[in-house]
Interface confidence: medium
């Protein structure tokens, strides 16, 4: 059954930028992910990046850098500077589009106790939805 | 306002083959999967597959595979179900749904179309 | 393919009364979803994602379940409510559909 993992990690040399990883375990084809923040996109949350496999990849601040790191993982980095740059306990959430199962969606956030530079591995996070 | 509207009823005999078509209107075409769900007389419903408009890829029912084609015409908005083979038990109402969404939040089938009757009969 | 089995395949209630539809999974879904279909008309989905109501759908429908086991609860019947209703997982392909539950006035 497919399902969504998501990783936060705070990066050691600057402390207030994060990289935020998120995979899908899947059959489905990825028609597209969507990263946000403060909650799921479309119920609260913000959008900060959407990564479409062929029409490219679109980010909004304080998103720096958004890329593709396999077929069914991306990887986000956040800027860590100004009114917008997230804290410790900010939530994000993925979203993959499946073709044609639909979408399938986990949060995650900083590990309450983890050290610059360090994270939890990236294990499955519940699925909020799967439409 | 959304809306799917699917070609009108068909009788075909055993072997053909049938095309039913879906014209959406309402909302942007290539956001929107479709799929096709079948319905025999006083039977459930039973999925036969869905299409990505934006792309034309496509996902079939096992069951189906080598008999439903499923195209898509972006320039007039309008879906197409082709079934070949035709046998009796094919004798149902066809109904294309407007799938999930990829840019707004959750949907799951929210528009159907009216469903097309098609008699398979010699 | 996973097979939901719906139960009872009719359940006779009156209005006002409380309805209590089950889904049975073959094997483990994330989530289920339910359509209710009126003679002659097309599905409507009701419940998405388990425990979602959909647009325009009202406060007396809710869903809960995991795992195999779903079930769609109708607080109090209106006399709209008496139709079939089916379940749907999305979760392993082919998408399947319970054979449904017939509402019917007692």
């Known amino acids: 059954t497919p399902e969504v993992w998501v990783q936060v990690r705070m990066e050691a040399t600057e402390l207030s930028s994060f990289t935020i990883r998120c995979g899908f375990l899947g059959s489905g084809s990825i028609s597209l992910v969507t990263v946000s923040w403060g909650g799921p996109n479309g119920a609260g949350g913000t959008t900060l990046a959407v990564l479409h496999p062929e029409r490219g990849i679109r980010q909004w601040a304080p998103a720096r850098q958004a890329r593709w790191e396999t077929q069914s993982s991306i990887s986000l980095i956040l800027e860590g500077s100004g009114a917008s740059s997230p804290c410790a306990n900010t939530t994000f959430c993925c979203k993959f589009a499946s073709f044609p199962e639909g979408s399938w969606e986990a949060c995650g956030s900083l590990p309450p106790s983890s050290d610059p530079g360090l994270s939890a591995p990236p294990t499955p996070a519940p699925i909020l939805r799967a439409d | 306002e959304v809306q799917l509207v699917q070609s009108g009823a068909e009788v075909k005999k055993p072997g053909a083959s049938v095309k039913v078509s879906c014209k959406a209107s309402?909302?942007?075409?290539?956001?929107?999967?479709i799929y096709w769900v079948r319905q025999a007389p006083g039977q459930g419903l039973e999925w036969m597959g869905t299409?990505?408009?934006?792309?034309?890829?496509?996902s079939y029912n096992q069951k189906f595979r080598g008999r439903v084609t499923m195209t898509r015409d972006t320039s007039t908005s309008t879906v197409y179900m082709e079934l070949s083979s035709l046998r009796s038990e094919d004798t149902a109402v066809y109904y294309c749904?407007?799938?999930?969404?990829?840019?707004?939040?959750?949907?799951?089938?929210?528009?159907w179309g009216q469903g097309t009757l098609v008699t398979v009969s010699s | 393919q996973i097979v939901l089995t719906q139960s009872p395949a009719t359940l006779s209630l009156s209005p006002g009364e409380r309805a209590t539809l089950s889904c049975s999974a073959g094997?483990?879904?994330?989530?289920m979803h339910w359509f209710q279909q009126k003679p002659g008309q097309a599905p409507r989905l009701l419940i998405y994602?388990?425990?979602n109501l959909a647009s325009g759908v009202p406060a007396r429908f809710s869903g809960s379940g995991s795992g195999t086991d779903y079930t769609l609860t109708i607080s109090s019947l209106e006399p709209e409510d008496f139709a079939v209703y089916y379940c749907?997982?999305?979760?392993?392909?082919?998408?399947?559909f319970g054979q449904g539950t017939k509402l019917e006035i007692k």
């Open positions: 749904a407007r799938d999930f969404i990829i840019t707004v939040n959750y949907p799951v089938v929210d528009y």
């Open positions: 309402g909302y942007t075409f290539t956001d929107y999967w």
């Open positions: 299409i990505d408009t934006s792309d034309a890829k496509t």
């Open positions: 094997s483990s879904v994330n989530y």
């Open positions: 994602s388990t425990s």
């Open positions: 749907q997982q999305r979760s392993s392909l082919p998408f399947t």
